[in-house]
């Protein structure tokens, strides 16, 4: 049996020497040299070899823990002479043992953290963590402790945990706001020769409402017309503040003194002062002179800080009311009025008022300063103050009419007063939706019916409050006709789809589309926009290749090159046809292809009459120019197409330099192919037209199963078909037999 | 789902008043011009007055201009329309719809008697 | 005011038959149309609007052709649900106007 225990192996060998592991012995050894150990698994007879005599094993390279902490291997010991086991295969650990040679790293780099300021010794912060990648189950080499290096007496670390508390009562943040704080992690224990790593740890403190407002001085004054009307100005106060955000926010208020009535105090909330404004209309003849207290406060106290003392302050504030000759006083600071755009010239918007405040009482009348209205859009009654239109007004030019409206004292035209006048012109539906852009899109001449070419959009200058609703429909003229469908997406959007399947580019190179885009708002508004839709040749992904229209209906459209090419072509295959014709004849009459499922050879020969009208129009050199072009399933062209609304034809392409190329590489392959027939060739240059039921004669035979085909209607093509009607009008009895 | 609830219907006497409700719910009831439609007993339906979305326009059939008045609260869902010296050929079933051209969505009506 | 025509105003027909309704304008009204369905006691159903879309979750029997002032509302093979009163309505321009209806009954 085999002798031996686990295998232990220390991490990291320096040595110059291979480490030696440990032994393999079996009983059946009797040191003679007939056995011979083998090794196997993790490492064998690379990190790990044996020799074979000795069973002694060694460690080749330095291994590394904690990237494999375990080798398992397989030892056999056999018969060196004739290689039989000696002893059963077994298997045996060499386990690596951990020394400490991983620093702890910190999960951050950079911590951040904020505790409030004048937080309670020991408040928690943050809680910082390392890891070692030692062994934390053999020895102290993945125990971590922490502590602090930089950030005393402020702060300070729990060893064990690695959570920073306070260390340090009333950190103030209007006195220090930053504390940078370094924590190190030791493994060891923290005992001597551990290996450790730091982090930074960047504390702020947040504001708390440690202080309370203070007026920098306890007097003010401020001088006010007796002409102020209520709401007016007079003069700002400013308590401030060392806190932030809303522990510094600050309400103002009256509490005291002979003008609480006549006086108001408003807080600015942007920058925190005390507006001090006009209640009631002052009157000089009555009272000259008022005194205020005003009192700063904060809105949000924290009770924990009252002991600091009351988080207000007061100032008194004097005012002096000068006396004025005064002009008209409007009824209202501005006016703001509404008007529809659909609003008739001469609509009255609204009206303005002002009056004489002094005990004369005289009389006003009213004008529009026209620096404020240069086009004269509007008018004022200059008795009552009726403000009408003198225009037409549009939403969708101009939303808000600013116009400043003057009234003068009649008596007295230097006592004049102007108010702000501010006319928002209301929306009406006047406006149609249209096209958010531009549409020119493309259809494939392989689409299949009912296929997603283009997703349309559209926009309405008119107000969309919170949102048009639009409906999409093509036009009444085009709904019938068209090759194409629109479906509206209920969602202000709509999609074109094909209505058939296939597209003919040498037919009709390019659509128009009218599409009735209308809101459903009152009243409805439409528009017909136009979408453009090229139909492309594409490759069997929809990508397109081509889109432009290139087809024997434009002849000119054709280089000499490319008429000459063709012409050559006819010529070979007409004389290969008339050639294998005359030599079938003095041939004895046996078939070319015995096989009942190849009948090519019946076709030659009763095809003695030539090409009819379909054949030749069928012939496309579009086809020629790009046969990857060719559908599977070709339309037929001996039918009228259909009506097709608004059709833009395309110039053809004039760059056919490519046929001859490709003409002679065509006929190159079937030169040297041995297989092909010389009539068969007529095939591979042109495609032959499915104007016939029957497709091309030379594919009779080429569908996928022998029922698919009825040839009966042969029949009925006369006495040059009669003999292909024999042969084939009958076939499905034969099939039977 | 798209629901239009109508309230306030009964029964007034000629010259009287009378403001009809409707809450919507299930769309963005901000984002649609609003229509009441009535229907006579035994009748055809009749338009008679459209809002804007923003409630900044209003419309009227004729036969209510003056009388009624169509009016919405975008913050309660709520479309409203204040009937005032009702006649008798008032008298319908009033429907509020969605829509200021074609009513994809209608409540279940209110009917509105004007009999002395 | 547009007036708006529809006709017949009743016809009866069996489940399975092709009903056509038509609806003519007293002048052209573009294709600003729409056709109600109403059941006794019920508020009216948009069927169709824009004189040919198909309201969204109306089933496709329902077809609707026309523009100008002759519309077509086509009931390809009726249903037992689709015995009812339809309206058109065109919103054209103010005052949006109604026709008279046209009952559909059973046979």
């Known amino acids: 049996s085999w002798m031996w225990n686990q295998f232990f192996l220390l991490e990291e060998y320096t040595g110059s020497d291979y480490q030696y592991v440990g032994k393999l012995h079996s009983d059946q050894d009797r040191g003679d040299g007939s056995l011979k150990y083998i090794l196997s698994g993790d490492g064998a007879g690379d990190l790990f070899i044996i020799n074979e005599n000795t069973g002694d094993i060694q460690a080749t390279k330095r291994l590394d823990r904690e990237e494999k902490p375990v080798y398992i291997l397989r030892a056999q010991a056999v018969n060196r002479r004739t290689g039989r086991p000696v002893e059963p295969e077994s298997e045996f650990i060499i386990k690596i043992h951990d020394i400490n040679d991983n620093e702890p790293i910190f999960t951050k780099d950079v911590y951040t953290a904020t505790v409030p300021e004048m937080a309670d010794v020991g408040t928690f912060v943050v809680q910082v963590t390392a890891t070692d990648a030692d062994d934390p189950t053999y020895g102290n080499s993945a125990k971590v402790v922490y502590s602090i290096l930089q950030g005393q007496p402020y702060f300070s670390v729990e060893s064990e945990t690695g959570i920073i508390k306070t260390a340090l009562l009333n950190m103030d943040r209007e006195n220090r706001e930053q504390y940078q704080v370094v924590i190190q992690a030791k493994d060891m224990g923290g005992q001597m020769g551990g290996l450790s790593g730091t982090t930074t740890v960047n504390i702020t403190l947040t504001d708390v409402n440690d202080n309370p407002p203070r007026f920098p001085q306890s007097t003010y004054q401020f001088k006010t017309p007796e002409s102020s009307p209520p709401g007016t100005p007079i003069g700002r106060i400013k308590a401030s503040d060392a806190d932030v955000g809303e522990n510094a926010e600050i309400e103002y208020s009256i509490t005291d003194g002979e003008g609480h009535e006549m006086f108001d105090v408003i807080t600015d909330q942007e920058t925190q002062e005390g507006i001090i404004t006009v209640k009631k209309l002052l009157d000089f003849e009555k009272k000259k002179v008022y005194t205020l207290k005003v009192e700063a406060s904060n809105p949000h106290v924290e009770p924990r800080f009252l002991y600091l003392g009351p988080f207000k302050d007061s100032a008194t504030v004097r005012i002096v009311v000068d006396d004025v000759d005064e002009p008209p006083v409007f009824s209202k600071l501005a006016y703001i009025l509404q008007i529809r755009e659909d609003a008739r010239i001469n609509t009255t918007i609204g009206s303005v008022a002002a009056q004489d405040p002094d005990a004369a009482r005289n009389p006003v009348k009213y004008s529009v300063d026209r620096h404020t209205d240069m086009d004269r859009i509007f008018n004022i009654d200059s008795g009552n103050g009726s403000i009408f239109t003198s225009k037409l007004l549009d939403r969708e030019t101009l939303l808000w009419h600013n116009i400043t409206v003057i009234a003068t004292e009649i008596n007295n035209p230097k006592q004049s007063s102007r108010v702000p006048l501010y006319i928002k012109v209301l929306d009406v539906n006047d406006n149609a939706p249209e096209f958010a852009e531009f549409y020119e899109t493309f259809v494939c001449e392989k689409a299949k019916a009912d296929q997603l070419i283009q997703t349309l959009r559209a926009v309405d200058k008119d107000d969309p409050y919170s949102g048009h609703q639009f409906s999409f429909s093509l036009a009444p003229e085009a709904a019938s006709s068209s090759n194409f469908t629109i479906q509206d997406n209920k969602d202000n959007t709509a999609g074109i789809l094909t209505r058939k399947n296939g597209y003919n580019r040498h037919e009709m190179s390019t659509y128009l589309l009218p599409v009735v885009i209308s809101d459903n708002d009152y009243p409805v508004q439409s528009s017909t926009g136009t979408v453009t839709v090229r139909v492309c040749a594409c490759d069997h992904h929809g990508n397109m290749q081509s889109c432009h229209a290139e087809a024997l209906i434009h002849p000119t459209g054709l280089s000499t090159g490319a008429l000459v090419a063709i012409l050559l072509c006819i010529v070979i295959l007409l004389v290969t046809v008339v050639l294998f014709a005359a030599l079938r004849r003095q041939r004895k009459k046996e078939p070319l292809i015995i096989s009942k499922e190849d009948i090519r050879d019946n076709i030659v020969s009763y095809n003695d009459e030539g090409g009819g009208e379909e054949d030749t129009q069928a012939f496309d050199i579009g086809t020629l120019r790009n046969p990857e072009a060719m559908e599977d399933s070709k339309s037929r062209r001996d039918i009228v197409p259909e009506a097709l609304f608004l059709p833009r034809r395309t110039p053809t392409a004039r760059d056919n330099t490519d046929v001859r190329d490709f003409i002679n590489q065509r006929l190159k392959e079937n030169d040297t192919d041995p297989t092909a027939p010389p009539y068969d060739s007529l095939a591979t240059y042109a495609y032959e037209g499915t104007g016939s039921v029957a497709d091309s004669l030379s594919s009779l035979e080429s569908v996928t199963t022998d029922g698919d085909q009825d040839y009966d209607y042969l029949s009925d093509w006369g006495p040059r078909f009669k003999k292909l009607a024999d042969m084939y009008g009958g076939m499905d009895s034969d099939k039977d037999s | 789902q798209v629901q239009l609830l109508e309230s306030g219907g009964g029964l007034v006497q000629p010259g009287g008043s009378l403001r009809l409700s409707c809450a919507a719910s299930?769309?963005?009831?901000?984002?649609?011009?609003m229509s009441w439609v009535r229907q006579a007993p035994g009748k055809g339906l009749e338009w008679v007055s459209v809002i804007r979305s923003s409630g900044s326009s209003t419309y009227y059939a004729d036969s209510v201009k003056g009388r009624f008045t169509i009016s919405r609260d975008n913050s309660k869902n709520t479309l409203y329309l204040q009937m005032n010296s009702l006649r008798a050929e008032d008298t319908a079933v009033y429907y509020c719809a969605r829509g200021g051209g074609y009513f994809d969505y209608w409540g279940q009506g209110t009917l509105v008697t004007v009999s002395s | 005011d547009i007036q708006m025509t529809q006709s017949p105003s009743s016809l009866s027909a069996s489940v399975g038959d092709r009903v056509t309704i038509t609806c003519r304008a007293s002048?052209?009204?573009?294709?600003?149309l729409n056709w109600y369905q109403q059941k006794p006691g019920k508020a009216p159903k948009l069927l169709i609007y824009a004189a040919s879309t198909l309201q969204s979750g109306v089933p496709s029997r329902f077809s609707g052709s026309g523009s100008g002032t002759d519309f077509t509302l086509t009931i390809s093979s009726l249903q037992p649900e689709d015995f009812a009163t339809y309206y058109c309505q065109q919103y054209y321009t103010s005052p949006y106007t109604f026709g008279q209806g046209t009952k559909v009954e059973i046979k």
């Open positions: 299930g769309f963005t009831f901000s984002s649609y011009a």
């Open positions: 002048q052209s009204i573009s294709l600003w």
